[in-house]
Amino acid sequence: ILLRAVTGFSGDGRAIWSKNPNFTPVNESQLFLYDTFPKNFFWGIGTGALQVEGSWKKDGKGPSIWDHFIHTHLKNVSSTNGSSDSYIFLEKDLSALDFIGVSFYQFSISWPRLFPDGIVTVANAKGLQYYSTLLDALVLRNIEPIVTLYHWDLPLALQEKYGGWKNDTIIDIFNDYATYCFQMFGDRVKYWITIHNPYLVAWHGYGTGMHAPGEKGNLAAVYTVGHNLIKAHSKVWHNYNTHFRPHQKGWLSITLGSHWIEPNRSENTMDIFKCQQSMVSVLGWFANPIHGDGDYPEGMRKKLFSVLPIFSEAEKHEMRGTADFFAFSFGPNNFKPLNTMAKMGQNVSLNLREALNWIKLEYNNPRILIAENGWFTDSRVKTEDTTAIYMMKNFLSQVLQAIRLDEIRVFGYTAWSLLDGFEWQDAYTIRRGLFYVDFNSKQKERKPKSSAHYYKQIIRENGFSL
């Protein structure tokens, strides 16, 4: 209440950039905190199907828009067959998970591995068997699965037939796919993520053309895609809430990604306003309809009125509250390359703690799962990834401070990623795994990097001990 009254920012995220120590929610007095995370803190690690599975056309899997994009847009990359081959080496992934000692494993289901042309008919048996075996193995190990339904690998057939996410027909098709997954896997899955970082799907898939399907320059298409992603998520949430939650008793959210930004001049109201607009145009675009009032942020509605679709009154009611926790992604994909429109002439920053405070203020202090966090190293770095350790320590320290000093309700952390793999537009030029994989080897051994040892220790100690 005090914050709202004094800053004049109505309790919104702009208070974060106030450098008056009485009013800013972030207390900068402790740069490093030696403390533990809350008891039963949820430690995990994640992968994306397209990045690690390989076997892009094996055992009846259909092509995805990324398989196609790799062949048509990315130089010097023949296919994701050269990745860490998780589809073949499932046991090696499980051993890697055992080594670290995580509480959960976040992975995504490849939609075209289950349904080659995207339409829910009879599932591809080998694909179904793969995910079922993985889930059984995780349950056996007491590792909680967090399952993402869509991590960018749209069945190519849906792109070619309907124009992909530009067409609202896909909303019902996605819901059918989700229904199938709930039916087949919901007995073993208590945490579901509908879509991973829809901002990047829309912005880079249809704006910059840096992601599949590689369309560019059509702002109306960007926001139509965003709109359909939000509506698809909402439809699936209501479906789960009505038909599956009563007996499966799980939780469902959508992973939203963002950068962080600092004003050029911390005392300048216009710069602070630009920082707020920057966060709103990336994170608020999706968070406001789902975690906020059910509509797009007012600033976006005014600025983009000619290209931003509308939510009707009924849809606003349908959208809002369709997430059981706030799943937040904070990593390189939202920073490089950064949308210059979103930057607004201000300074990007890797301050995860402040980003978490912004979410707390904007969306009424939700429970937060860090659903993706980490950095990257050059592809030449093998197992001695000191930069990755430095970044992990920094990020985890910020999360701990957010919990202990700012009373932010972070309940879990997903280190990204379990394995080196295919890194989207960067292909194999960077590595994000805690386990090193030699992509040219036959056996694709998972070798723990220094960061894997470090994360293992953090989990064992539940934080930073003196």
Epitope: T242, P309, I310, S312, E313, A314, E315, H317, G321
Partner: antibody, heavy 115, light 107 residues
């Protein structure tokens, strides 16, 4: 299956209040909105207001000072109260299950405002 | 408020005919647009929602189209039971508004 039914007083004196109850079955009021619509004799339809699953309400701006919509989820009932009635409030009053469309309507209840 | 101008206000057609009813909004309503049928006994049912989607149980001879400000309802192969008044409806902006109605008579 979904059913919607209005029950009202039939005749109301001018300056008095009108109360109508809409009883629904086949769906939950916690999940869906219900709108009130009226139709004066021989004329078109006029939307009055909606109460949503979460309890929030939108009223027609022309009636906001006289109209109150409430509900009782446990009884599956929605209530309309219109104050200070005049002759041109004479109409058939309908309630309807609401999304971005009215997919199920009641049969309507005729309300005549007359001394 | 968004005004909905419906034309014609009445029409008469023969069994088997194809008829079209039009509705024009005073501003862009982004396909948030519906059609209803009111029978002579007063019962109302939804025919078409979101401009062109056929409500479950409605015969396929009813179809809707349009965008922006202009929308239409087409009934092909007219049947006796189609004698009714048809209303258009926008939900783009509050307050939601209806067209004045089109009374369809069968010759």
């Amino acid at each position: 299956q979904v059913q919607v039914k209005e029950s009202g007083p039939g005749l109301v004196a001018p300056s008095q209040s009108l109360s109508i109850t809409c009883t629904v079955s086949g769906f939950s009021l916690t999940n869906y909105g219900v709108s009130w619509i009226r139709q004066p004799p021989g004329k078109g339809l006029e939307w009055l207001g909606v109460i949503w699953g979460d309890g929030s309400i939108n009223y027609h701006s022309a009636l906001i000072s006289r109209l109150t919509i409430t509900k009782d989820n446990s009884k599956s009932q929605v209530f309309l109260k219109l104050n200070s009635l005049e002759a041109d409030d004479t109409a058939t009053y309908y309630c309807a299950k609401t999304h971005d469309w009215f997919d199920y309507w009641g049969q309507g209840t005729l309300v005549t405002v007359s001394a | 408020d968004i005004q909905m101008t419906q034309t014609p206000s009445s029409l008469s057609a023969s069994l088997g005919d194809r008829v079209t009813i039009n509705c024009r909004a005073s501003q862009d309503i982004s396909n948030y647009f519906n059609w209803y049928q009111q029978k002579p006994n007063g019962t109302i049912k939804l025919l078409i929602y979101y401009t062109s989607r056929l409500q479950s149980g409605v015969p396929s001879r009813f179809s809707g189209s349009g965008s922006g400000t202009d929308y239409s309802l087409t009934i092909s192969n007219l049947e006796q039971e189609d004698k009714a008044t048809y209303f258009c409806h926008q939900v783009r902006t509050l307050p939601w508004t209806f067209g004045g109605g089109t009374k369809l008579e069968i010759k």
